[in-house]
Structure formats: C-alpha cells, structure tokens
Interface confidence: medium
C-alpha cells in the first residue's frame, strides 16, 4: 500500500496548529471498517493517535491530535496537531493497513520569532573615545536557536570580540544574549541582528553612542535604600525619581530599568515613547508621572526568579542609575505533624515527628520545643526542597524518646516577612501492661 | 531603473592621484551604503572600501589605508573615490557597487560600469 | 584575511550541461555570495546568502553549502552562462573575492 507524505518538513509556529499530511489511495469498494489507520512518533514509537473498527479511537498525545473523519473514506489520513510546542518537533509516523500495509513518515519543524533585539551599553555614561565599552543585545523567546550577527554604522561586520550565549527556557524557547565588546571611537552606531534560521526572520536592533568629550553634572536618581519586599502573586512597585529642570520635556528623557547584573533590559523609555516592556511582559511604568520626575517600575505577578536588583537608568542631558533590591517572599502554610509508629505508643518508645510546611519563600527557619517551651535541637533534620515555582516545601523530622505523655511544637518562620506558622502534637503513651 | 553611472577613463602618470565619481539614480542615494571595487587586467576582484552616504562614515581594506579617499556629495547623490600616489600596479577597472538594501545584507546588487584607469609614465 | 579558493579555475562544457564549481574559504564564513561576469562588463549578483536566487536570475543556477564549502550549481547550461564566476564572503573584514571559476565552451 503507497502512503505518501510531503517531503518536506512542515514548519508550525509554537501555540499554531499543524497539519501533518498523509494520505492513500482507497480501492473501489473501500469502507473505514477495514482501515487500521496509526500515528506514532517515529522515534521512541509512542502512540499519537489512531483509527481502528471503524472508529477514531482519539488522541493518545496530550488531547491536542484530531484526523480529518470527513476525508478518511477519500484516502486524507492527515493528522492535526494544535497548539503546537516546541517538544512536538520531530519526525512523525504515518501507518495504514487495509488488506496490504504502507507507512512513511513526516517531520515537524517547530518554529518561534525572535522579538526585536534590546540594547544594552556597561558602561552606560561618561564615555570617551578609547574607552571599552560592552554592549549586549537580547531577543526573546525563539526557536530553533538563532544565527547572531554584528555590524558597525557602515555595514563592516563585526566578528572579533563577540560572545553570544543562547538558554532554552521551561517551553524550550530561546532567549539570546549576545555580547560586543569595542572600543569607541568619536561616535558610532553598532548593529546587532537576530536571524531564525527556519523562519528565515530577521530581527534588529542599532545603539549610537556619542562619547562625551568634557564630564558634565550627573542627574541625580534616587531609589529606597531597603529592599522591597514583594509577596508571589502580587504586585510590586520599584520606585525611582529624579529631579527636572524647568522646561523638562519627556522627548529629552532616556529611561531604562535592566536586571543589575545580567544587564538584561526589562522596560525602557526612549524617544518621547514607552518602549514596554522586554520582561516577560509584566512590567508597566507611570506614564502620567514621568514629566514629574517619577520612572517607578511596576513589576505585576511577582515570582521567585525576579527577586535581585534593578537599576534604574535616567538620561536627560547628563546622566544617572541607581540600583532597587526586591526581595521576594511567601508565608508558609500552618505546619502538618505526623507520627511514625503512631500506635500502640508506650513510655520510652522512640516515636519520629514530621512537621511539614509548604510553599514559602525564602527558605525558613524551623524551631522545636517540647510542652515545657524547652527548645529541642538534638536529633533534628530539616530539608527544604524548592518547587518549579521556587517556592519551598519544609519537612523537619525530630526522633524523641517518649516520657509518660508529652507535646511537641514546631514553629516555621518566614525570615524576610517574621511571619511563624506553627503546629503540635499531643503524645499520650499508652501505661505497659 | 536603478543606475550607477560612472565617469569616464582616466590616463595618470606615477605619483599622481585620480578621483572616480559615481552618480546614482533610481533609488533615495542615502539609504544604500556605496562600495568600490577593482579589477586589474585579466585578475580577480578586489574589495577597496565603502562609504554610508547617510553619515559620510567610511570603512577601507586595510591595504588602501592612507592612499583612498570616500566621499559623497548627497546634492547630487554622487559617490567619489580619489586614490592617491598611484603606481602602475593601480592600473585596473574600477566599479562602484551598492550594497544590498537591508543593513546585513553583505553584498552587492547593482554595479556602476566601471571606469578604466591606467598608470602610465 | 579569509581567503576563498575556487575550484576549478576554468572548465570547459557543452550547453545542457550540469556543471558544478566550489569555493572553498580558509575559515568558517556565515555565507556566501556568487557573481557573474562577462568580459568588458561590471559583475552581475547571481546568488545571495548561499542560496538565495538574486532577482531576475533564472532558476537553473543554483548555491549551497555552510562552513567552509560552497557550491555554486548551473543545472542545464546555457549558451548564454559562459562566462567568469566568483564567490565574495564578508563573514569578516576585508571583504574577499575567489579568484574565479572561468566557464568555456567545449
């Protein structure tokens, strides 16, 4: 039986949806009762989906897999995979058996644009000729991995001194980071461009850079000196002023918040205009504040990963950053206790305690005391295990000898926000008999 | 119709120099940074420098560094080339040739017809 | 410098010939682009981004490659592809010519 399938891979968008052709050539007098039709995923043979007795037996794939029933009957034994993800990419197989059997396989080429590159400049102010400066350029959430070029304001290619690093995030999309190192000279435009191999999309981004020639005054920007603390799942405002002149206008102002250390960009304002923002869109800033000197950040639905420093940049005419610690946090939950044995206790059995508490953040502080407030140490083990979102899962174990009766206490302290959960256990050890 | 025109052939003697010109038409002159390009006789291609007609910054080979000069004149959207101290190895065809549209598009799409220059005493 | 050597430097095929040319270059490049050129006349873009046709160049020239090979591919010849071939990189400065595949007629 010929089973034809295109040659080419099929080349899907992440979140589209993709039609894996495949198709046969029914005999007169063919009917779906006798068509065994299978999809399974060439390599590891894992069933996707199938249609056996007559009948679409479904989705074997994560319920995102669907067949063409209309055109069954006229050889279409096409396979629709939704909202395509990155690990979907792969060769699949497409099986038919009539009377005689046939199979051929397809491959599906998983593809994402990268965003439009940001640009960074370390150092960012009082810049000379001569002085080496690094500028990084970062575009987001691509795939496959992108081709990264540079060039200077006359179109010469830049190849020395670059380092480009891709990461592939949870969804296996990749964020690029690409690093020029150049000394500058009177002034100069650099140029880095972000190529998807596959989509054959470019994407780009220029800085100038203008050195100055004489040091002029700074601008004066000013942060709270304390960390900001931030619950998971809340908002957080990282605030930052500065001080305009009279006759300020926003056209003049160059704002950028960027991660301190990586120098990633997470929100600009550039060229009288919000730029938005380049993290995970979950920032905003003040627009009706700005003209009074307030370039505050925003950062919505606070995680775990964001806990760090931001800086905050302000140019005008002269220059100015200032860095914000967040801290991030998360109350535990109230302590479950568990006894192991927890029957048949007598006096002088030595019983396990388990005190468990979930999904704090950061990492707590775990205290035991008996009925008498007396604190416990000896033979305690705490282990603190962090979850995908970051946040802590706490289970501290006490081995104790048991008296005639007692209670045993575990308090769980959050450390950022001084917040204690607590729970007990009353241990009543049967008399021997 | 998109042209590059170039002025004619030129006869100079050793120590002299030679300024080619090379006018442009049929698209906007400062969007298109503008190269040369010679070819001596019966010999390959070889790369001299450009010019961002936008800016008027220039980018030379190494090895014309101190005898050639790009500029522009945007007026008239007219490139120019001046070599200096010629010798008669500088004998050779030159071209200007613009490079392609898109700023990393490292090549050249349309081509002057080049302007024959001999170094002679 | 990176240099490109073309291979070979001329040869000689009759009119519906396959006729395949390399360039070969010294270090890796990101691509490669191929002209042609006819005596007396300025060279003419053929073929852009290794494997990309450059706009009004009929479909039986063809390019291919990545690294440091490159391959330039005339799938029928034609009276009119006679002519002198090179590939130019600009992975990195000085931007570079091969020193050309000539093609004659038999």
């Known amino acids: 039986l010929e089973v034809q399938v295109p040659e080419d891979p099929v080349v899907a968008l992440v979140g589209t949806d993709a039609t894996l052709c495949c198709s046969f050539s029914p005999e007169p007098g063919f009917s779906l009762a006798q068509l065994n039709l299978i999809w399974q995923l060439t390599d590891t043979k894992q069933l996707v989906h199938s249609f056996a007795e007559g009948q679409d037996q479904g989705s074997a794939y994560a319920n995102r897999t669907a067949l063409f029933p209309d055109l069954l009957a006229q050889g279409n034994a096409s396979l629709r995979l939704q909202r395509v993800r990155v690990a979907d990419e792969g060769s699949f197989t497409c099986f038919v058996s009539i009377r005689d059997f046939g199979s051929a396989a397809v491959s599906l080429q998983v593809a994402a644009p990268y965003s439009k590159p940001s640009m960074t400049l370390e150092p960012n102010k009082d810049l000379r000729p001569g002085d080496t400066v690094t500028i990084t350029c970062s575009s987001y959430q691509g795939y496959p991995e992108a081709e990264v070029f540079w060039q200077d304001g006359q179109g010469v290619p830049l190849t020395g001194n670059v380092t480009t690093s891709q990461m592939a995030n949870e969804q296996g999309l990749f964020d690029v980071h690409s690093i020029l190192r150049v000394v500058l000279g009177a002034n100069g435009t650099y140029s880095c461009l972000v190529r998807n191999p596959v989509l054959q999309q470019d994407a780009h981004s220029s800085v100038t850079i203008t050195p100055q020639r004489s040091p002029t005054g700074a601008v004066e920007v000013q942060v709270p000196e304390d960390p900001v603390v931030a619950l998971v799942g809340t908002d957080a405002t990282l605030r930052c002023s500065f001080s305009p002149e009279p006759g300020f206008s926003l056209a003049q102002l160059n704002l950028i918040w960027q991660l301190t250390d990586t120098k990633q960009l997470v929100h600009s304002f550039t060229e009288g205009r919000d730029q938005g923002s380049a993290y995970a869109n979950r920032t905003a800033l003040f627009p009706d504040l700005l003209a009074q000197g307030n370039a505050s950040l925003r950062l919505q639905r606070v995680r775990v990963a964001d806990e760090g420093s931001f800086t905050c940049f302000v140019s005008i005419r002269d220059f100015g950053s200032a860095a914000v610690s967040l801290q991030v946090a998360a109350p535990y939950s109230k302590p479950s206790m568990t006894l192991e044995p927890n029957k048949d206790l007598r006096p002088g059995d030595t019983v396990t305690i388990t005190c468990s508490s979930y999904r704090g953040y950061p990492e707590a502080e775990v205290f035991w005391q008996d009925g008498q407030g007396v604190p416990l140490t000896g033979n305690v083990t705490t282990s603190q295990m962090a979850n995908e979102q970051g946040l802590f899962d706490v289970h501290s174990v006490l081995r104790v000898v048991l008296g005639a009766n007692g209670t045993y206490s575990c308090l769980v302290r959050n450390p950022v926000l001084q917040q204690d959960a607590h729970g007990s256990v009353t241990i009543t050890g049967q008399p021997m008999t | 119709e998109v042209q590059l025109v170039q002025s004619g052939a030129e006869v100079k003697k050793p120590g002299a120099s030679v300024k080619v010109s090379c006018k442009a038409s049929g698209y906007t002159f400062t969007e298109y940074i503008m190269h040369w390009v010679r070819q001596a006789p019966g010999q390959g291609l070889e790369w001299m420098g450009g010019?961002?007609?936008?800016?008027?910054?220039?980018t030379y080979n190494q090895k014309f560094k101190g005898r050639v000069t790009m500029t522009r004149d945007t007026s008239i959207s007219t490139a120019y080339m001046e070599l200096s101290r010629l010798r008669s190895e500088d004998t050779a065809v030159y071209y200007c040739?613009?490079?392609?549209?898109?700023?990393?598009?490292?090549?050249?799409?349309?081509w002057g017809q080049g302007t024959t220059v001999t170094v002679s005493s | 410098d990176i240099q490109l050597t073309q291979s070979p430097s001329s040869l000689s095929a009759s009119v519906g010939d396959r006729v395949t040319m390399t360039c070969s270059a010294s270090?890796?490049?990101?691509?490669m682009h191929w002209y042609q050129q006819k005596p007396g006349k300025a060279p003419k873009l053929l073929i852009y981004?290794?494997?990309k046709l450059a706009s009004g160049v009929p479909s039986r020239f063809s390019g291919s490659g990545s690294g440091t090979d490159f391959t330039l591919t005339i799938s029928s010849l034609q009276p009119e592809d006679f002519a002198t071939y090179y590939c130019?990189?600009?992975?990195?400065?000085?931007?570079?010519f091969g020193g050309g595949t000539k093609v004659e007629i038999k």
């Open positions: 010019i961002n007609p936008a800016s008027g910054g220039t």
């Open positions: 981004d290794t494997s």
């Open positions: 040739a613009r490079k392609g549209k898109d700023y990393f598009d490292w090549y050249f799409d349309v």
């Open positions: 270090s890796s490049v990101s691509y």
């Open positions: 130019q990189q600009w992975s990195a400065s000085p931007l570079t």
